[in-house]
Amino acid sequence: TQNKALPENVKYGIVLDAGSSHTSLYIYKWPAEKENDTGVVHQVEECRVKGPGISKFVQKVNEIGIYLTDCMERAREVIPRSQHQETPVYLGATAGMRLLRMESEELADRVLDVVERSLSNYPFDFQGARIITGQEEGAYGWITINYLLGKFSQKTRWFSIVPYETNNQETFGALDLGGASTQVTFVPQNQTIESPDNALQFRLYGKDYNVYTHSFLCYGKDQALWQKLAKDIQVASNEILRDPCFHPGYKKVVNVSDLYKTPCTKRFEMTLPFQQFEIQGIGNYQQCHQSILELFNTSYCPYSQCAFNGIFLPPLQGDFGAFSAFYFVMKFLNLTSEKVSQEKVTEMMKKFCAQPWEEIKTSYAGVKEKYLSEYCFSGTYILSLLLQGYHFTADSWEHIHFIGKIQGSDAGWTLGYMLNLTNMIPAEQPLSTPLSHSTYV
């Protein structure tokens, strides 16, 4: 049934996150007269679109309309009809579409054209679909978590209104892991950002922020797995790949054509004497970790210090919120607790990867096998990326907070994106004193 218009003066906004593995629709709501206050926007709905990411629709663009229908209809139900025409809708596509565009601008354009046509059919104020840059993805993720944590509020509080809050205005760094890319964004401590491409300057609520960000395309968990398989099959003696990143007893056939479909595996491409190969899991964390490390080139650094692949990374500073797949994977593995040390995480990963596949399937009967089979790799990859890639240590591990939601809103780039596009983060501090979140919660 159609909702009746609310008596209070509220506004809504919709953002679709078109990721490499799936699309999610987020609905945000805020009091109209408090648009410039910090922390007043909150998420009222998340709708996960059934099916893969939009980049997989290249051969079936005619199905995109149907694919988006359920979640767009859900938005129609959630948002009062009287608000439909003034509710902005934004679609941001991330690394999956960046990779498709790298292969062919024509195919990427075609997918986005059909997406735009589909979204224009709804009664909302459609503002366009575009591929956002990796820099934007990192920046908006950082804005989202700090906005939700109340870090931009100038009012100091004696009480904590959100988890992870340390009663100071020092911002959190943002660690985002997707299927095709991963982003690291934070304010370094009095450190020059040596690479201009990685430097962002913001003025938010009257304060200046010099932010470091980098997006590692092809280093999302799914593309990292394709890279690892392409690297390892190069040295396989036959069409059997004994893989330590999968559980003992696990078997899966992979088409070589699928392996080389992505630009991420281009550097490992070679003519193989077979069209298919079989992954046979051997479940060894240490060997899996070693194999993953080979994806990170740490031998070359043209700066004072680097993450990997010659990319500048300043010394880590402060606390970090790790979200998206960092959170989903660690949550599945039951490793998100603040009390779990890095050594304990490693120990638990060793045990988990060594468990036989049949046992794993029984223990997690409700989980799709495709996802279930990859948690050993994904967990090991997260550890490798954070420790060897970004140089977290056993000591600094405690500064990483695995975050799913903050105050009921998902951590991710979408909220920051909407706040920016609707001009809801002022450069200067608003004249009226913002009320604390607790007024609205």
Partner: antibody, heavy 116, light 111 residues
């Protein structure tokens, strides 16, 4: 705005090698492939190959395989094309072009003259 | 390799008149509902400039008098009203498959 700036003209002897550079600006260098195309005097344009700056993987026109090498320095947002064992018929203007399948941006061209 | 054959080799058209250039591919350059066909304009001493992509879409900043049509193997570039600055060599190109190939070029002059 997107710009591709190539290195200057070169004169080489037969059998030598030449390395042409292409510095990119105005976009994220690793988000697009870089192609190399050449044009001999009065001839049609001829595609040499491309590189994925993201990871250094490359694909070549069979005609140039083994003789052409394409590399990148991502920290300098620069692509390079090296052609070895030069012969007189390699005298041409060499262009870099950004694109997946759409060559929307081109360098100004580098004239390579092979002469004894 | 896909061979791109352009016709005519050269073309002399009066100012304000229509110029039509054809390009035929030795096999279809269509894939996933997209024509991987492009038209470039090249003036002496300059790099090629993208006019048309995907057979019929205008490149950025390209005047409306340039249009492209066709699909599969047969394509046409049309200049609806020739201007003095349109004197150049025009090339077609396919990027459906490696090696990407170009047509031999059509020289457009003023009659």
């Amino acid at each position: 705005q997107v710009q591709l700036v190539q290195s200057g003209a070169e004169v080489k002897k037969p059998g030598a090698s030449v390395k042409v550079s292409c510095k990119a600006s105005g976009y994220t260098f690793t988000d697009y492939n870089m192609h190399w195309v050449r044009q001999a005097p009065g001839q049609r344009l001829e595609w040499i190959g491309y590189i994925v700056p993201l990871n250094g993987g490359s694909t070549f026109n069979q005609k140039f395989k083994g003789r052409a090498t394409i590399t990148v320095d991502t920290s300098a947002s620069t692509a390079y094309m090296e052609l070895s064992s030069l012969r007189s018929e390699d005298t041409a203007v060499y262009y870099c072009a950004r694109g997946g399948t759409r060559f929307a941006y081109w360098g100004q061209g580098t004239l390579v003259t092979v002469s004894s | 390799d896909i061979v791109m054959t352009q016709s005519p080799d050269s073309l002399a058209v009066s100012l304000g008149e229509r110029a039509t250039i054809n390009c035929r591919a030795s096999e279809s350059v269509d894939n996933f509902g997209v024509s991987f066909m492009y038209w470039f304009q090249q003036k002496p001493g300059q790099p090629p400039k993208l006019l048309i992509y995907g057979a019929s879409n205008q490149g950025s900043g390209v005047p409306d008098r340039f249009s492209g049509s066709g699909s599969g193997t047969d394509f046409t570039l049309t200049i609806s009203s020739l201007q003095a600055e349109d004197v150049a060599v025009y090339y077609c190109q396919q990027t459906k498959e490696v090696p990407y190939t170009f047509g031999g070029g059509t020289k457009v002059e003023i009659k």
